[in-house]
């Protein structure tokens, strides 16, 4: 692999944590790290056919890390797509022109040197601009294991044209049964996107109890179709030794 510059072209300030190299000393080794993680937050890219896609993984490390790309977990070679692709090592990016439906998939950048390896995955969907069913970002909502009394946030990233209706549901039991007479699971609607519902893509649970453990579903629909993805919440009691000790001796104030 070609070696990109360890400078991050996206950052004007010098945020490097490395020690500057002097004439006589070798720089301290630094495992790869993201220099602009906030620019990598958008994971789902829904792009019309024929447009250009640019994925970036701005990084640094000492020595200079290498950059390589996978598609759906496998080595991605230019001859794997019509028109190939361009890797811009100076800006830690891959560019694919004139995308087509066969370009759909997960694209992973791997940045590594001898002191470590980091990776990040983007999801590409090639869409018709005309109305389509909702698309949900893979891996969201994510499973959570939290302590009793904690607050929990589930997130669902949605791409939809037209405007989608978002519901958060929880699978429940009725009279000891999870399935109703209509052969559909019993669910409780926890939240839905209405006129006044802000941030419908996020479900927040406060001060959770063990009874709130279970499966939570993000269900998104528009007039063309629907999509849903679910996650499990596990609420755990703290182990006995983790509980606060009960003070039996008197407290003396000096």
């Amino acid at each position: 692999d070609a070696l990109p510059s360890s400078e991050d072209d996206d950052d004007d300030d010098d945020s490097s944590s490395e020690e500057k190299e002097t004439d006589n000393t070798k720089p301290n080794p630094v495992a790869p790290y993201w220099t602009s993680p906030e620019k990598m937050e958008k994971k789902l890219h829904a792009v019309p056919a024929a447009k250009t896609v640019k994925f970036k993984c701005p990084s640094s490390g000492t020595p200079n890390p290498t950059l390589r790309w996978l598609k759906n977990g496998k080595e991605f070679k230019p001859d794997h797509r019509i028109g190939g692709y361009k890797v811009r090592y100076a800006t830690w990016s891959i560019i694919m022109d004139s995308v087509v439906p066969s370009d759909k998939g997960n694209y992973t950048c791997i940045v590594e040197n001898e002191y470590g390896s980091i990776n990040h995955t983007y999801q590409l969907d090639v869409v018709e601009r005309s109305p389509h069913r909702p698309i949900l970002q893979a891996g969201l909502p994510a499973n959570k294991t939290v302590a009793l009394g904690s607050n929990v946030e589930f997130m669902c990233k949605v791409y939809s044209d037209p405007q989608p209706h978002i519901q958060w549901l929880k699978h429940i039991e009725v009279n000891g049964s999870k399935i109703g007479p209509d052969n559909l699971p019993y669910v409780q609607i926890l939240k839905h996107s209405g006129i006044n519902s802000s941030d419908a893509e996020v479900l927040t649970l406060f001060n959770v109890t063990e009874a709130q453990s279970g499966e939570y579903v993000c269900k998104v629909s528009n007039y063309i179709g629907e999509a849903n993805q679910s996650a499990w919440l596990t609420v755990t009691r703290p182990a006995l030794e983790e509980r606060p000790a009960v003070m039996t001796s008197p407290l003396y104030l000096e």
Epitope: D9, D10, K39, H45, V47, P48, A49, A50, K51, T52, K54, K56, K86, R88, T91, I95, D97, S98, V100, E128, R129, S130
Partner: antibody, heavy 116, light 109 residues
Framework: QVQLQESGPGLVKPSGTLSLTCAVS?????????WSWVRQPPGKGLEWIGE???????SYNPSLKSRVTISVDKSKNQFSLKLSSVTAADTAVYYC?????????WGQGTLVTVSS | SYVLTQPPSVSVAPGQTARITCGGN??????VHWYQQKPGQAPVLVVY???DRPSGIPERFSGSNSGNTATLTISRVEAGDEADYYC???????????FGGGTKLTVLG
């Protein structure tokens, strides 16, 4: 190589409808491209109007969306622009262009004047 | 909607280097394209995908893009380079094309 040629009336009355056609030669309008309209008022910059894919899928400039219709005729290998309720502010050179993420080539442009 | 900001004018002496900037929020995440337009003519693509040149465009034309600024660089400027230059992106968030306001390049002398 692909060439584009705009045609249509050079003069349109206020409140009327501007209609232009772009003929595509040297390539198929059914290729993986967006077929676009861009305009340039006299002495001013370029303004994107909208675009169409051969499937009929469209995207329009929000500031013009209520007045714009772009259509494609695959049998004639051409696409068209209709802009309704025109005013003097719509006087411009109108270009058609082939687009992926960028535009190449462009038509030579046609001046449309809105005047009574 | 996404806004691209260009300086209205840039002046340079023949043989020198001209740099035309195009500012936009996190523009480094987008692919930027540049057009040259001479009076009475249609625009011509001179740089695409930040830094690639179409065939027939001299090597003197180059581009870069990072952070909040994309730059078109014209080295060894010639009198024939005098024109208006426009940057353009496809804004993936709004799914719309956007042009900068244009920069008039004047070659002095």
């Amino acid at each position: 190589q692909v060439q584009l040629q705009e045609s249509g009336p050079g003069l349109v009355k206020p409140s009327g409808t501007l209609s232009l056609t772009c003929a595509v030669s040297g390539g198929s309008i059914s290729s993986n491209n967006w077929w676009s309209w861009v305009r340039q008022p006299p002495g001013k910059g370029l303004e994107w109007i909208g675009e169409i894919y051969h499937s009929g899928s469209t995207s329009y400039n929000p500031s013009l969306k209520s007045r714009v219709t772009i259509s494609v005729d695959k049998s004639k290998n051409q696409f068209s622009l209709k802009l309704s309720s025109v005013t003097a502010a719509d006087t411009a050179v109108y270009y058609c262009a082939r687009g992926t993420d960028w535009y190449d080539p462009w038509g030579q442009g046609t001046l449309v004047t809105v005047s009574s | 909607s996404y806004v691209l900001t260009q300086p209205p004018s840039v002046s340079v002496a023949p043989g020198q280097t001209a740099r035309i900037t195009c500012g936009g929020n996190n523009i480094g995440s987008e692919s930027v394209h540049w057009y040259q337009q001479k009076p009475g003519q249609a625009p011509v693509l001179v740089v695409y995908d930040d830094s690639d040149r179409p065939s027939g465009i001299p090597e003197r034309f180059s581009g870069s893009n990072s952070g909040n600024t994309a730059t078109l660089t014209i080295s060894r400027v010639e009198a024939g380079d005098e024109a208006d230059y426009y940057c353009q992106v496809w804004d993936s968030t709004s799914d719309h094309r956007v042009f900068g306001g244009g920069t008039k390049l004047t070659v002095l002398g």
